[in-house]
Amino acid sequence: HTAAQDNCTCPTNKMTVCSPDGPGGRCQCRALGSGMAVDCSTLTSKCLLLKARMSAPKNARTLVRPSEHALVDNDGLYDPDCDPEGRFKARQCNQTSVCWCVNSVGVRRTDKGDLSLRCDELVRTHHILIDLRHRPTAGAFNHSDLDAELRRLFRERYRLHPKFVAAVHYEQPTIQIELRQNTSQKAAGDVDIGDAAYYFERDIKGESLFQGRGGLDLRVRGEPLQVERTLIYYLDEIPPKFSMKRLTA
């Protein structure tokens, strides 16, 4: 354990092993679980983060109505298959050969099947609606202050280009953040809205993925913004394919 290794850390992903074995002794970090090299100047993909997590020891009117095709991640954690770029593979299977198709944020978008199930392409999640309820405060937050602070948060903590934060809605105590990013809009180097939403979700739950000891301390004009409930809806460029049985259950 050398001094050089001590100086080697990944600010954007604490679930990494880092060593100075990059070019010129540069710090190089690899994600736990997959061993894939990660770029510590930006967010790590959700797929690699989920894989790392599974490998770790177990321990009204202005508000948007989610569309009928919106998905909620009800399946919880699983150990995903990631492609060489760290994205979710379109088809995911568990150890018992049960398979299903996922979207670009890793949320199931078909019924579960067997190994014969085909998932022709990874369907992009182009619209994410983050629905928050904040804890009671003395008064409502000023909407424009709240809007500015949340946009700044996504820009400066999650490195998400401001154009992808489509809107911030507020009707006390509900806050909704809309992220939109079509395939054609996303340029090389742009943070994916799915990754930004995942980092935000983990921050809000007090499970920060960033290296620092502290978590996210979110304040609006000095007033702490504490979230007591989070729901995230995912809308895909192609609607999901579930059987009627699931839809009526």
Partner: nanobody
Framework: QVQLLESGGGLVQPGGSLRLSCAAS????????IGWFRQAPGKEREGVSC????????YYADSVKGRFTISRDNSKNTVYLQMNSLRAEDTAVYYC?????????????????????WGKGTLVTVSS
Amino acid sequence: QVQLLESGGGLVQPGGSLRLSCAASGFTFDYYAIGWFRQAPGKEREGVSCISSSHGSTYYADSVKGRFTISRDNSKNTVYLQMNSLRAEDTAVYYCATAGDGGDYHCSGLVDYGMDYWGKGTLVTVSS
């Protein structure tokens, strides 16, 4: 083990200059934003200046704009605060700090509650 060590403080006359240094170790320096904060006797700690990680954006409190300049030398793992035209009200203990997220969120706001790691401080006294 993250460590931040400030130096360069001292006694200076009004209108004089000082250059503070913040030497960092224990982390990949060039990935992190570094900020300077100060605390005068009997007052709350306040943000003075901050410099971002990748693109080198700089942020200053209104009270020091045009007088103080922040810079960083990634090859030396050091951030500097050049303080010119010093005034009596600049007297304080100056601390450097870094946020563990590596981003600019807490840096641009010059807010101390977002900073994870702190140095022990260096005293700057401006007096005739």
